[in-house]
């Protein structure tokens, strides 16, 4: 059920921090039914910690990259790892955290004016959009310069929360980030209890937007811990 | 041409087990996500689980959940579906389906009739 | 989970008709949406995906529009091939849900 899913708080405890929504660190990410896990295993918990093995960044959360948890060690053995800060060494953008990129081999901060047509990630087909429009095809290529001239609309494939336009957040979507629409008062959310602990939520939703934060739905609070249903609320 | 080729259905028991292939050809099958759908005789459609490009991850619907595994080999253009401890309401026709734009299921394949009765 | 309700559920048309078919979700889903046509025995085909955009290769008489909770697909000119049965579909978020269908028959 819906409760069930919002209240499972999928953790999947990696080297903090996780943060929350893209661009926003610490923001509450409501969960969408269908935070996938391989083989189904949906809730895991601090107490059934499994690393999240991928492919390729794309299948990890958007405060993630995927590489081999050992320094040179088997490639064929990847997991979701914790994206790097500023000033840390890194290989590739994706290692670099939400508002930073990868230059001469150290996370420095995006500039938002800066084009950033050599950023690498999965976008898809553009169908002849200005913003490449969501398809099931997954491939590396390059950004072209007019993604940047106009901000993303719902649909967008996006990096950051910066790509989209005002009231949408960048969030995952399958194997892909798209434009969605930040929450609005009375829409469902999650409160994770604890800073970095929110997982791969491959459907997210956005977080709440401006005045308001995400709490306990007034008429649940007789309820059990585990069925306890958040909201957007005013402040 | 784009083309979907299920296996593997037929009639089994309550409590047995089926697995389901489905071959493609004539696109580059490691691209693309996929699913499994299914349709009871005279009935609607119902998404029943989907992979990723790689398989990095998985999705099942709840009525199948713990029962059924879905899996892909890619060096084989292949799909699977592993069905277990079927139950009487797992009969249907299921499809294999490629995501296309906007993750709707492009291309199907033609189906197979997986019948549960003792 | 959305819950994807399709109106009518069943339809009587003539060839040259203008048909509609509605399809209300229970949540926002953007333009997550795609309608497929089936014939009897055969797998479906998609029609129209992202709410309106025409697949490759269907007919221009097929038009979708709407997008957040509430969409429709339009016949404009009922075709003797088009006598079939119609389903909506989200993709905003797992499960996937298909509107129960809607069936369009020959007056």
């Known amino acids: 059920t819906l409760n069930s899913v919002l209240n499972s708080n999928a953790i999947k405890n990696l080297p903090p921090p996780l943060g929350g929504a893209a661009g926003h660190p610490g923001s509450a990410v409501s969960a969408a039914p269908g935070i996938l896990y391989p083989g189904g295993n949906k809730y895991q918990t601090i107490d059934n910690y499994q690393p999240y093995p991928c492919a390729e960044d794309e299948e990890c959360g958007t405060d993630e990259y995927c590489a081999s948890p050992t320094r040179g060690g088997d490639a064929g053995v990847q997991i979701c790892l914790a994206c790097r800060k500023r000033r840390k060494r890194c290989m590739r953008h994706a290692m670099c955290c939400p508002g930073n990129y990868c230059k001469n081999g150290i996370c420095v901060s995006s500039d938002q004016n800066h084009f950033r047509g050599e950023i690498e990630e999965t976008i898809t087909e553009s169908f002849g959009n200005d913003h490449s429009t969501l398809d099931g095809y997954s491939r590396r290529t390059t950004l072209s310069s007019k993604m940047y001239h106009t901000k993303g609309q719902e649909g967008s494939v996006c990096l950051r929360s910066s790509d989209c336009a005002s009231g949408l957040c960048c969030a995952r979507h399958f194997w892909s980030k798209i434009c969605k629409p930040v929450l609005k008062e009375g829409q469902v959310c999650t409160k994770h209890r604890r800073k970095g602990s929110h997982g791969l939520e491959i459907f997210q939703r956005c977080y709440c937007g401006e005045g308001l934060s995400c709490r306990i739905q007034k008429d649940h609070h007789q309820a059990s811990n585990s069925s306890r249903l958040h909201t957007c609320q005013r402040h | 041409e784009v083309q979907l080729l299920e296996s593997g259905g037929g009639l089994v028991q309550p409590g047995g087990s089926l697995r389901l292939s489905c071959a493609a050809s004539g696109f580059t099958f490691s691209n693309y996500g996929v699913s499994w759908v299914r349709q009871a005789p005279g009935k609607g459609l119902e998404w029943v689980s989907s992979i990723s490009p790689s398989g990095g991850w998985t999705e099942y619907a709840d009525s199948v959940k713990g029962r059924f595994t879905i899996s892909r080999d890619n060096s084989k253009n292949t799909l699977y579906l592993q069905m277990n401890s079927l139950r009487a309401e797992d009969t249907a026709v299921y499809y294999c389906?490629?995501?296309?734009?906007?993750?709707?299921?492009?291309?199907w394949g033609q189906g197979t009739l997986v019948t549960v009765s003792s | 989970d959305i819950q994807m309700t399709q109106s009518p559920s069943s339809l009587s048309a003539s060839v040259g008709d203008r048909v509609t078919i509605t399809c209300k979700a229970s949540d926002h889903i953007g333009k997550f949406l795609t309608w497929y046509q089936q014939k009897p025995g055969k797998a479906p085909k998609l029609l129209i995906y992202?709410?309106?955009t025409l697949q490759r290769g269907v007919p221009s008489r097929f038009s979708g529009s709407g997008s957040g909770t509430d969409f429709t697909l339009t016949i404009s000119s009922l075709q003797p091939e088009d006598f079939a049965t119609y389903y909506c579909?989200?993709?905003?978020?797992?499960?996937?849900?298909f509107g129960q269908g809607t069936k369009v028959e020959i007056k």
């Open positions: 389906a490629r995501y296309g734009a906007y993750f709707g299921l492009d291309y």
């Open positions: 992202a709410a309106s």
């Open positions: 579909q989200q993709s905003y978020e797992t499960p996937l849900t």
